[in-house]
Each structure stands twice: as structure tokens, then as C-alpha cells.
């Protein structure tokens, strides 16, 4: 049988494929024996297609994203699901099929000129739609490679840091994301006390550069919790 390892943890107890040894064309290996459809049945295979367990979008195929198969289902169980076509509902870019991105909860076309216009539009829109953020989830590789032929310079619209030139990262700016400089020694940085709190930032900073970490500035130790200043300092 095939054993899949995610971050060095084997997904154990995979049943043998139909008809024998792992790897024979047409064979199917059941991935997550405990996952149920909303109706209570185990996954039905279509042409021996077996869902692939995942932890992030990048592990899936180019036309898939990683999510829990049932709305409000067990958050611990995620599989690769078919991407959403244009005008379908979405919560992040990776949910939309290649050539589209998620805007205000709907998959819209991301052809180059159209995409740039859409991004500029989103900056002027009122904040408050749960789905309007261009969040920090992993982005579809084909989307970014389609849109950016050269690495983005400072201020260029981006989807992820790999879209930006060396020394820059992709960070939120209003409701779009642009390439910003990676922070240098002594520059103010953001230390997130709560996991996921970076999602609330409208003006997101880059991370500290190599050999630096974001720590409380020495002379600010006495200050109150809310006003403590963090800067990039040598390890």
C-alpha cells in the first residue's frame, strides 16, 4: 500500500488498492477511511477517483483547493476539492479555477488587465465584507505564473511573496496585496500575539530579514502592553 506522509506523519492504515500492489494504473487507495458524505455514506469513487487528503492548497492539483468536504464539517479532515468556476462563491483565491480570483466572495476573471483594474477597484470599496480580503492563504501557482512574467518591483500587485523581486515580500495594502521591502535591522515590525491576527491588518508589514527577529525594543520594556514597540533585531 501507499503511505503518504505529511510533515513526516504517515497517514496510516491505507487499504490496499483494488487488485494488488500500490501504483498500478487504475488502482484506487482509500485515503481517509473515516470521512463521510453529508448523507452518511463513505465517498463513492467515480472512475476509481479517490479524494486526496491535504493540509494546504499547494498539495492539491492545479484545478483544486484544500478544504473540509462538508460545510461546517470536521475541520481536522480536509481533502482536495474541485475548484470553483467563474461567478461561483469563494472565500479565497485558491478556491477559484485558474484564470480567476476571489473578489467579494465571488470568483471573477483574472486576465491581466482585468485583474489589475479589479484590484484597484477593491481599494475604494467599503471594508466589511467578510470575503473581500485578499488573505494570506497559499495561492494557485498557475494563477501567479500567468499574471507575472517578471518578478514584481516595490509597489507591484502580487498574490504571494514569490511574485516579488528579491528583498521584497507580498503584504496587504488596503484591500490588495503589493510587494513591500523586507524589514531591515532597527525597523519597526509587527509581533502577532494571537495566531491569525495578521488577517486584521490593512497595512501589513513584511517580515524581518535574514538573521533578524521581531523583538521588543530594549527601551520599551517598561511601557504598557498595548504600546510596546517591536523592531527587527539580530538573533
Amino acid at each position: 500500500t501507499l503511505n503518504s506522509v505529511l510533515n513526516s506523519n504517515a497517514i496510516k492504515n491505507l487499504p490496499p488498492p483494488l487488485g494488488g500492489a500500490a501504483g498500478h494504473p487504475g488502482s484506487a487507495v482509500s485515503a481517509a477511511p473515516g470521512i463521510l458524505y453529508p448523507g452518511g455514506n463513505k465517498y463513492q469513487t467515480i472512475d476509481n477517483y479517490q479524494p486526496y487528503p491535504c493540509a494546504e492548497d499547494e498539495e492539491c492539483g492545479t484545478d483544486e483547493y484544500c478544504a473540509s468536504p462538508t460545510r461546517g464539517g470536521d475541520a481536522g479532515v480536509q481533502i482536495c476539492l474541485a475548484c470553483r468556476k467563474r461567478r461561483k462563491r469563494c472565500m479565497r483565491h485558491a478556491m477559484c479555477c485558474p484564470g480567476n480570483y476571489c473578489k467579494n466572495g465571488i470568483c471573477v476573471s483574472s486576465d491581466q488587465n482585468h485583474f489589475r483594474g479589479e484590484i484597484e477597484e477593491t481599494i475604494t470599496e467599503s471594508f466589511g465584507n467578510d470575503h473581500s480580503t485578499l488573505d494570506g492563504y497559499s495561492r494557485r501557482t498557475t494563477l501567479s505564473s500567468k499574471m507575472y512574467h517578471t518578478k514584481g518591483q516595490e509597489g507591484s500587485v502580487c498574490l504571494r511573496s514569490s511574485d516579488c523581486a528579491s528583498g521584497l515580500c507580498c503584504a496587504r495594502h488596503f484591500w490588495s496585496k503589493i510587494c513591500k521591502p523586507v524589514l531591515k535591522e532597527g525597523q519597526v515590525c509587527t509581533k502577532h500575539r494571537r495566531k491569525g491576527s495578521h488577517g486584521l491588518e490593512i497595512f501589513q508589514r513584511c517580515y524581518c530579514g535574514e538573521g533578524l527577529s521581531c523583538r521588543i525594543q530594549k527601551d520599551h520594556h517598561q511601557a504598557s502592553n498595548s504600546s510596546r514597540l517591536h523592531t527587527c533585531q539580530r538573533h
Epitope: 506522509v5 484506487a28 477517483y49 479517490q50 492545479t62 483544486e64 482536495c80 474541485a82 501557482t141
Partner: nanobody, 129 residues
């Protein structure tokens, strides 16, 4: 021209270790899964291990789980297969292969040889008892 070149094979005693290396040239393989297959004389080619385009994900055949470790370095376009606690039954020609990231993925994708577009020439591993 795309080429996969294996190296590191050889003769080793049972219980010993070897590290196979596969170097890709002619294109970048960062959006490909890289896998190792092996073929013993008179037997079918079988899946050994694979590592996806997403570096966190590795896959192993039952027979090598816990003994073999696959890793990759996209910057150097190389894939390594570290083999320890080798057994005589590991004797085979080991092939490196590359499979493109598909539109849809299933559990058997990585272990299915027909999904791999590029193959190396192979390197012989012989484990003596």
C-alpha cells in the same frame, strides 16, 4: 533537452546504507512530483517513494516506510533517496522520474508510473547478504 540523471548506486551489505541522487537538467521541476521506482530482474517496475511539488508531502511504499527517506532541493534541481537498513530484496535498478502537477489529484497519483513524464536511465543497487 530534459534529462534526469541518477547516481549513488552500488554494492552494499545487508543492513547498510546508500544515498541515491537524481539531478534534473533542461528545465525546472518545482511544479513536478519527483519519484523513485525500482525494477528487480524478472519483476515489474514498482513504486518506492515520491515527493510532491509541495515539499511537505512525501509518499512511500509499505516495503520501504521507515527505512527510506526522500527529499528534494529545488534550487539545485536534485532529489535524494536515503536508504538505510537495506535488505537483499531491495536489490534492483532504481529509476528517478518526474510527474507534472495534475489538474485533479487522487491518492494513487504518486504511485502510478504512467503519470510520470520523464525518466532517468537508472542506477543499480545491489544488497548482498
Amino acid at each position: 533537452e530534459v534529462q534526469l540523471m541518477e547516481s549513488g548506486g552500488g554494492l552494499v551489505q545487508a543492513g547498510g546504507s546508500l544515498t541515491l541522487s537524481c539531478t534534473a537538467s533542461g528545465r525546472t521541476f518545482d511544479n513536478y512530483a519527483m519519484g523513485w521506482f525500482r525494477q528487480a530482474p524478472g519483476k515489474e517496475r514498482e513504486f518506492v517513494a515520491a515527493i510532491s511539488w509541495s515539499l511537505s508531502r512525501t509518499h512511500y511504499a509499505d516495503s520501504v516506510l521507515g527505512r527510506f527517506t526522500i527529499s528534494r532541493d529545488n534550487a539545485k534541481n536534485t532529489v535524494l533517496l536515503q536508504m538505510s537498513s537495506l535488505k537483499p530484496e531491495d536489490t534492483a535498478v532504481y529509476y528517478c522520474a518526474a510527474a507534472p502537477r495534475p489538474k485533479r489529484i487522487s491518492v494513487s497519483y504518486f504511485s502510478t508510473s504512467s503519470n510520470y513524464d520523464y525518466w532517468g536511465q537508472g542506477t543499480q543497487v545491489t544488497v548482498s547478504s
